[in-house]
Interface confidence: medium
C-alpha cells in the first residue's frame, strides 16, 4: 500500500480555488525527491500538470503552484480559476509518475448556483442553525407571514404565522415576528440537514401587494481534515462543536459502509471493543469542545471519523459534526514492541517501551488505563523519581536499554495488575504505546524469603534462588528507591536446592548487608538480565530493629518471618504469593501526605484482545 495520502474527493465551484495537501513519510530520500500532480487519462497514463522541479503545464499557467514542506512531510498544490473542465481524476505523488508512490484524488468542479436577483445566500454547516430574515412593508404588518421552499417547479409551504409547520421541519423550526418597530420577520431552522439545502421564498401577505424575498440555503457537509499518523502511534481528534451543544452528549464514530457511522466512544459510556485499553475521551469544556486520544494505531483504524453531538450519543440526521480522514502510515518510525506481556501471580514483568531516539532526554512516563466513564490514565511512575504510593517497592522505570527504548519493571504481581498500560514521553513527537499485562497460571521463577528483619550493627544475608533456565543470565541484587534500583554486591553460593528436576545450573545468589544501619531498611530486588535487557525480579522487604544479643543473621526461605499470604512448600522453602506486603513503618512520613490520585483506584479487568506480539514476563 502506498504511504502517500491526500484527500480522496475535492469539491469546488467554477471560478473558485482549491488547495490540496498530500502527505508522505518524511524520510531523507522522500523530502528531496520530485513531487508531482498529474491528471489520469482514459487509457491509464498520468499527464504531469505541475511538479516541484519547476514544470507547469500550459493548462495551469498562471493559476497553479506546488509547494513542498519537507519538515512536515507534505506538499501543497494550489489551483485557481477553476472551470468544469478541471473535473476529473488526478494523482499526487513522489518520484516518477508510473512508480505507484501516489494517491488518487477526485476533483469535482460544479456550476455555480443560478440565483434570482435579490437573492440572499446563506451558507451553513450541517447540523447548525440558520436564521432567514424576511423584510416587509408597513401595509403587510398584520398579514400572514410564510416561508416556502422551491421543490422542482412548485413552492411548498414550510411554515407560516398561523401555526402551520411542514412535517419535514417539525421540532426544529420557528417563525419569529420582531417587535412593532421592526418591519422584519425571521425563520430559524436548526439541526440543519443536507436535504434542507435549496431555494426558499419568504412572503408577507398573500395578494399582489405581498412582500417577497428570495433566499438560497447551502448546507455544507464538513470537509474532512486529513490526519497522517504512524502505525503503532497515536492520534488526537479535537472536536469543537460550539457552546450551543455544550450540554448534549458527544460522540466519535467511524464511518463504515454507506452512511453508517459506528460509535467508537461517547460521553454516555459506550466504547467499541476494538478500542479497549487505547482510547481516552477528554471531557468537554464549557464551550462544548472535547478531544479523543487513540493510541496503538492499527492498519484497520484508518478511515473517516466524525465527532458530533446528539442526545442519543450517536450520529443522527441534523447532528452538528466535524470530520477527519485518518491515514495510518505502515512505514512507521515507531518500532514494534510487545503489545501483550504475561506474568504470574507473585512474579514480575519487564515491559519494553519505545520512544523517539532523538528525544533521549525527554521524561518517560507509565500510566494505567482505566475504562470507567470516558477512560483515564493515572500516572504510576516517571523517569524523574515520581512513583505512585501503592507501587512503592514494586515498580521501577529504567532508562535502559536506551537508544529508543526504556524499561518498566513491575513485581509482586496480583490479578489486580492485569490491564492496559501506556508508555509515553513528554517529547515533541508525543509517542504513546500500549501494552496489556495478563496474569496467567504459574509459579514465580525466582524464590526469595518473605519479609526479613535485620538487626542493627549485625550482618544480614538474604538468599535468592534462580532456576536453571536462567543459567546464562546475569544475576543481581539491588536496593529499590523512587529513581530506580541501585545495584549491590552479591555472592554466588553455588547450586540451589530450591528446585525439583533442576540440574547444577540452578543458582543461589545472596545479598549480604554488613553492619546493618537504619538506612538499610527498605525494598531489595533480586533479578536477572542480559546486558541491558531485564527479565524477572523478586522483591524482599528488609526491616531493621535493635537486638540485645550480638551475632549475624543468615535468612533461609524457611526461617524468614511467616506472612499470612505465604505458602510453606513441602521442600521446606517458602514462596510468597505476595500482596505487596509492606512494613507499616515504611515511608511513615510520606504516607501522611495524602495523594489524591490514590483515592480513585478503581478495579481493573483484563481484556484478552489476542495478539501475535506477546512477550512472557520471565525472559526476553
Amino acid at each position: 500500500k502506498s504511504p502517500i495520502f491526500g484527500p480522496e474527493e475535492v469539491n469546488s465551484v467554477e471560478g473558485n480555488s482549491v488547495s490540496i495537501t498530500c502527505y508522505y513519510p518524511p524520510t531523507s530520500v522522500n523530502r528531496h525527491t520530485r513531487k508531482y500532480w498529474c491528471r489520469q487519462g482514459a487509457r491509464g497514463g498520468c499527464i504531469t500538470l505541475i511538479s516541484s522541479e519547476g514544470y507547469v503545464s500550459s493548462k495551469y499557467a498562471g493559476r497553479a503552484n506546488l509547494t513542498n514542506f519537507p519538515e512536515n512531510g507534505t506538499f501543497v498544490v494550489n489551483i485557481a480559476q477553476l472551470s468544469q473542465d478541471d473535473s476529473g481524476r488526478y494523482k499526487c505523488g513522489l518520484g516518477i509518475n508510473s512508480r505507484g508512490l501516489s494517491f488518487d484524488v477526485s476533483l469535482e468542479v460544479s456550476q455555480g448556483p443560478g440565483l434570482l436577483n435579490d437573492t440572499k445566500v446563506y451558507t451553513v454547516d450541517l447540523g447548525r442553525t440558520v436564521t432567514i430574515n424576511c423584510p416587509f412593508k408597513t401595509e403587510n404588518a398584520q398579514k400572514r407571514k410564510s416561508l416556502y421552499k422551491q421543490i422542482g417547479l412548485y413552492p411548498v409551504l414550510v411554515i407560516d404565522s398561523s401555526g402551520y409547520v411542514n412535517p419535514n421541519y417539525t421540532g426544529r423550526i420557528r417563525l419569529d415576528i420582531q417587535g412593532t418597530g421592526q418591519l422584519l420577520f425571521s425563520v430559524v431552522i436548526n439541526q440543519l440537514r443536507l436535504s434542507d439545502a435549496g431555494q426558499y421564498l419568504c412572503q408577507a401577505g398573500d395578494d399582489s401587494n405581498s412582500n417577497k424575498k428570495n433566499a438560497d440555503l447551502q448546507v455544507l457537509k464538513p470537509e474532512p481534515e486529513l490526519v497522517y499518523e504512524d502505525l503503532r502511534g497515536s492520534v488526537t481528534f479535537h472536536c469543537a462543536l460550539g457552546p450551543e451543544v455544550a450540554n448534549v452528549a458527544k460522540f466519535l464514530c467511524r464511518q463504515s459502509s454507506g452512511e453508517n457511522c459506528d460509535v467508537v466512544v461517547n460521553t454516555l459510556g459506550k466504547r467499541a471493543p476494538a478500542f479497549e485499553g487505547r482510547i481516552l475521551l477528554n471531557p468537554q469544556d464549557k464551550d462544548g469542545s472535547f478531544s479523543v486520544v487513540i493510541t496503538g494505531l492499527r492498519k484497520e483504524d484508518a478511515g473517516r471519523y466524525l465527532c458530533g453531538a446528539h442526545s442519543d450519543g450517536q450520529l443522527q440526521e441534523g447532528s452538528p459534526i466535524q470530520a477527519w480522514q485518518l491515514f495510518v502510515n505502515e512505514e512507521s518510525t515507531i518500532p514494534r514492541s510487545p503489545t501483550v506481556v504475561k506474568g504470574v501471580a507473585g512474579g514480575s514483568v519487564a515491559v519494553l517501551c519505545p520512544y523517539n531516539r532523538k528525544e533521549s532526554k525527554s521524561i518517560k512516563y507509565w500510566c494505567l488505563w482505566e475504562g470507567a466513564q470516558n477512560g483515564r490514565c493515572p500516572l504510576l511512575v516517571d523517569s524523574e523519581g515520581w512513583v505512585k504510593a501503592q507501587y512503592e517497592g514494586r515498580l521501577s522505570l529504567l532508562e535502559e536499554p536506551g537508544n529508543g527504548t526504556f524499561t518498566v519493571i513491575l513485581n509482586q504481581l496480583t490479578s489486580r495488575d492485569a490491564g492496559f498500560y501506556w508508555c509515553l514521553t513528554n517529547g515533541d513527537t508525543l509517542w504513546r504505546t500500549t501494552v496489556e499485562i495478563k496474569i496467567i497460571e504459574g509459579e514465580p521463577n525466582l524464590k526469595v524469603p518473605g519479609n526479613v528483619t535485620a538487626v542493627l550493627g549485625e550482618t544480614l544475608k538474604v538468599p535468592c534462588h534462580f532456576p536453571c533456565k536462567f543459567s546464562s543470565y546475569e544475576k543481581y541484587w539491588c536496593k529499590w528507591n523512587n529513581t530506580g534500583c541501585q545495584a549491590l554486591p552479591s555472592q554466588d553460593e553455588g547450586p540451589s536446592k530450591a528446585f525439583v528436576n533442576c540440574d547444577e545450573n540452578s543458582r543461589l545468589v545472596s545479598l549480604t548487608l554488613n553492619l546493618v544501619t537504619r538506612a538499610d531498611e527498605g525494598w531489595y530486588w533480586c533479578g536477572v538480565k542480559q546486558g541491558h535487557f531485564y527479565g524477572e525480579t523478586a522483591a524482599v522487604y528488609v526491616a531493621v530493629e535493635e537486638r540485645k544479643a550480638a551475632g549475624s543473621r543468615d535468612v533461609s526461605l524457611a526461617k524468614a518471618d511467616a506472612a499470612p499470604d505465604e505458602k510453606v512448600l513441602d521442600s521446606g522453602f517458602r514462596e510468597i504469593e505476595n500482596k505487596a506486603i509492606q512494613d507499616p513503618r515504611l515511608f511513615a512520613e510520606e504516607k501522611a501526605v495524602a495523594d489524591t490520585r490514590d483515592q480513585a483506584d478503581g478495579s481493573r479487568a483484563s481484556v484478552d484482545s489476542g495478539s501475535s506480539e506477546e512477550q512472557g514476563g520471565s525472559s526476553r
Epitope: L280, L281, N282, P283, S291, V293, T295, I363, Y365, C367, W369, N374, G375, R376, C377, P378, L379, D382, E384, G385, W386, V387, A389, W422, L424, N426, L430, R432, N482, E590, V593, D595, T596, R597
Partner: nanobody
Framework: EVQLVESGGGLAQAGGSLRLSCTAS????????MAWYRQTPGNERELVAR???????HYVDSAKGRFTLSRAQDKNTVDLQMNSLEPDDAAVYYC???????????????WGQGTLVTVSS
C-alpha cells in the same frame, strides 16, 4: 490554564543568599512536580531542583548543600533558598509546574516568565 509568577530575583554578593518564590494560580487540581530551572545566554535551560507531589525533593549536584527547596501547605507555592552563591549561579531562573492529565494521558508543562539572578564577585 495555569499561571506561574516568580519573585525574589536580584543582585547578590558572592557567598551571599537570595530566596526565589513561585506561586501557581488558575485551574489547578493537583501539581505533580514543581521545579526551578535556570538559563544562561546561549545555553539550554537546565534543572536546578524539583519537588514531587509526595514531597520527595531532587537537586542537581551543583545545588546540593547550598540550595533548599520548600513548599507551602497548599502545595501551590515553592521557594528556592539559595545560599553560598557563586558567580556561576548567575542566570535567569524559571519556575516550572507539571500537571499529569489522567484524561489526556500526558503531562502538561507550564513555565513562569523568569527572574534574573546576578552574582557579583
Amino acid at each position: 490554564e495555569v499561571q506561574l509568577v516568580e519573585s525574589g530575583g536580584g543582585l547578590a554578593q558572592a557567598g551571599g543568599s537570595l530566596r526565589l518564590s513561585c506561586t501557581a494560580s488558575g485551574t489547578i487540581s493537583k501539581i505533580d512536580v514543581m521545579a526551578w530551572y535556570r538559563q544562561t545566554p546561549g545555553n539550554e535551560r537546565e534543572l536546578v531542583a524539583r519537588i514531587f507531589s509526595n514531597d520527595v525533593t531532587h537537586y542537581v549536584d551543583s545545588a546540593k548543600g547550598r540550595f533548599t527547596l520548600s513548599r507551602a501547605q497548599d502545595k501551590n507555592t515553592v521557594d528556592l533558598q539559595m545560599n553560598s552563591l557563586e558567580p556561576d549561579d548567575a542566570a535567569v531562573y524559571y519556575c516550572n509546574a507539571q500537571i499529569w492529565s489522567d484524561m489526556r494521558g500526558r503531562m502538561d508543562t507550564y513555565w513562569g516568565q523568569g527572574t534574573l539572578v546576578t552574582v557579583s564577585s
